[in-house]
Interface confidence: medium
């Protein structure tokens, strides 16, 4: 309706205020100046606009900033952020951690949306690496964030950032991700003493190689079964019965309950039954006495 395109007399918005919640969509379109909206974005979030009204406000900003919103506007988007598409967000250049926090706050308590994932991606790429402050912020809002990154993306995490990682942040990480994170953690915690070091490194051990597990077995660390079960199978297989006994300490008894599961099952198959019997746990499936064990991988390496 053409006659509705002009702003009715006396309705031109001089500021973004609560009177606008009573404007019809076409009145908002006609009576609110986009530049005024951009300078008073911080007010929008304090006013209970309907979703339909927010659509109109977004449209006005899109017209004003076709190349993407400036950060001064982005920081104050508030609930309008939920109206943005990943395509919109890809046009942004977000550099301030405060802006990132403000937008994550809007989505707090919900699963990571495609919008949030795109926002984080833009932010991290803009910074060049996943620094400690950013990681602190992201894992506070999304504990599983770290495990959502590819090994390639994780490679940009500096060792110093590892201090911000909590055990629960790694719950959903797969071995490939832990392979990348473990060396960084080892580097980050290298100056800590034995027991303190183990407490910090424990969550990352799913990426540890055999030689590091052997070293840990000499330090009376008493690794729990849950941690042991997350170790790389290829790292556990070469460990001797004596090393596993030292590594687990009192938790060694738990091997019986896990004897049918990896990596325990595969490790048992590699041990001499005599050695397994010394544990007194009734573990079965080891190599019978008198059998010769050929390490084919070593043979291949020599040929």
């Amino acid at each position: 309706e053409v006659e509705k395109t002009a702003c009715p007399s006396g309705k031109k918005a001089r500021e973004i205020d609560e009177s606008l919640i009573f404007y019809k969509k076409w009145e908002l379109e006609a009576c609110v100046d986009a530049a005024l909206l951009a300078t008073q974005m911080d007010r929008v979030n304090a006013i209970p606009f309907t979703y339909e009204q927010l659509d109109v406000l977004k449209h006005k900003l899109d017209e004003l900033y076709p190349q993407g919103y400036p950060e001064s506007v982005i920081q104050h988007l508030g609930y309008l952020f939920l109206k943005m598409s990943p395509e919109d967000i890809r046009k942004w250049n977000v550099t301030s951690l405060e802006t990132l926090k403000a937008l994550l706050e809007v989505n707090k308590g919900h699963e990571m949306s495609p919008q949030v994932a795109t926002l984080i991606d833009r932010f991290v790429k803009g910074r060049g690496q996943l620094d400690k402050d950013t990681l602190d912020t992201l894992t506070a809002f999304y504990p599983g964030y770290l495990c959502s990154l590819s090994p390639e993306e994780l490679s940009s995490v500096p060792p110093s950032s590892i201090w911000a990682v909590r055990p629960q942040d790694l719950d959903t990480c797969d071995p490939r991700q832990l392979d990348v994170l473990y060396p960084k953690a080892r580097l980050a915690f290298q100056n800590m003493n034995g027991s303190e070091y183990f407490v910090k490194i424990q969550s990352f051990l799913g990426g540890a190689p055999t030689e590091d597990l052997k070293a840990l077995s000499q330090q009376n660390v008493s690794m729990d079964l849950a941690t042991f079960m997350k170790l790389r199978t290829d790292a556990v297989l070469p460990l001797t019965v004596a090393e596993v006994q030292k590594l687990l300490g009192p938790h060694v008894e738990g091997l019986k309950a896990e004897e049918r599961h990896r990596p325990v099952r595969d490790w048992i198959l590699r041990q001499r039954q005599d050695d397994l019997d010394t544990l007194g746990l009734g573990l079965q499936g080891g190599i019978p006495n008198g059998y010769l064990v050929l390490d084919l991988s070593m043979q291949e390496a020599l040929s």
Partner: antibody, heavy 116, light 110 residues
């Protein structure tokens, strides 16, 4: 200059009725939501009712719902509050205020006393 | 009992900075703006802060407001004797579909 002037207060018996008016000037009355707020003697502020510019929906505090009715006449720039079945606890100074989320202008108030 | 809780009283000496808190016990106010009102003895209330932190023209910059999560606060710096008044916070409650005020804080300038 924005001005809000309440009238219609006075002494009324419990169960009685009263109609308050608020004459507005200095702004485009038909563009803004309006509200009634009251304050019992020595007590804090209590929101009573709110009405949007087009009278589309009306909002009431639980304590007055079903007894009070808010209305407005945009052609007369006037806000009204019809109060029925008045109780002793309705005794208060009644203020009209501009807006519904942040009351940027207030009248001077009119005293309503409900007593036998 | 109000869903907005304020301390009943606060005090300070001239020149001091005082802060009045407003704690919200309803999640329905979380996303809505908080306003602050000053009521001098024997007068109608006056809007002091709106949209959490905005000052209407004419209100000195000694008055400032902030809001974080379910808590809002009003700060008054360089306290003056004329600041002695009752202060109320208020916000729209989306579940009640109505406006709520805090119980008010009586500020005394010693």
């Amino acid at each position: 200059e924005v001005q809000l002037l309440e009238s219609g207060g006075g002494l009324v018996q419990p169960g009685g009725s009263l109609r308050l008016s608020c004459a507005a000037s200095g702004f485009t009355f038909s563009n803004y939501a309006m509200s009634w707020v009251r304050q019992a003697p020595g007590k804090g502020l209590e929101w009573v009712s709110g009405i949007p510019p087009d009278s589309g929906s009306k909002y009431y505090a639980d304590s007055v719902r079903g007894r009070f009715t808010v209305s407005r006449d945009n052609s007369k720039n006037t806000l009204y509050l019809q109060m029925n079945s008045l109780r002793a606890e309705d005794t208060a100074v009644y203020y009209c205020a501009k807006n519904m989320l942040s009351f940027d202008y207030w009248g001077q108030g009119t005293l309503v006393t409900v007593s036998s | 009992q109000s869903v907005l809780t304020q301390p009943p009283s606060a005090s300070g000496t001239p020149g001091q900075r005082v802060t009045i808190s407003c704690i919200c016990s309803s999640s329905n106010i979380g996303s809505n703006a908080v306003s602050w009102y000053q009521q001098l003895p024997g007068t109608a209330p006056k809007l002091l802060i709106y949209y959490n932190s905005k000052r209407p023209s004419g209100v000195p910059d000694r008055f400032s407001g902030s809001k974080s999560g379910t808590s809002a606060s009003l700060a008054i710096s360089g306290l003056r004797s004329e600041d002695e008044a009752d202060y109320y916070c208020g916000s729209w409650d989306s579940s009640l579909n109505g406006y709520v005020f805090g119980g008010g804080t009586k500020l005394t300038v010693l």
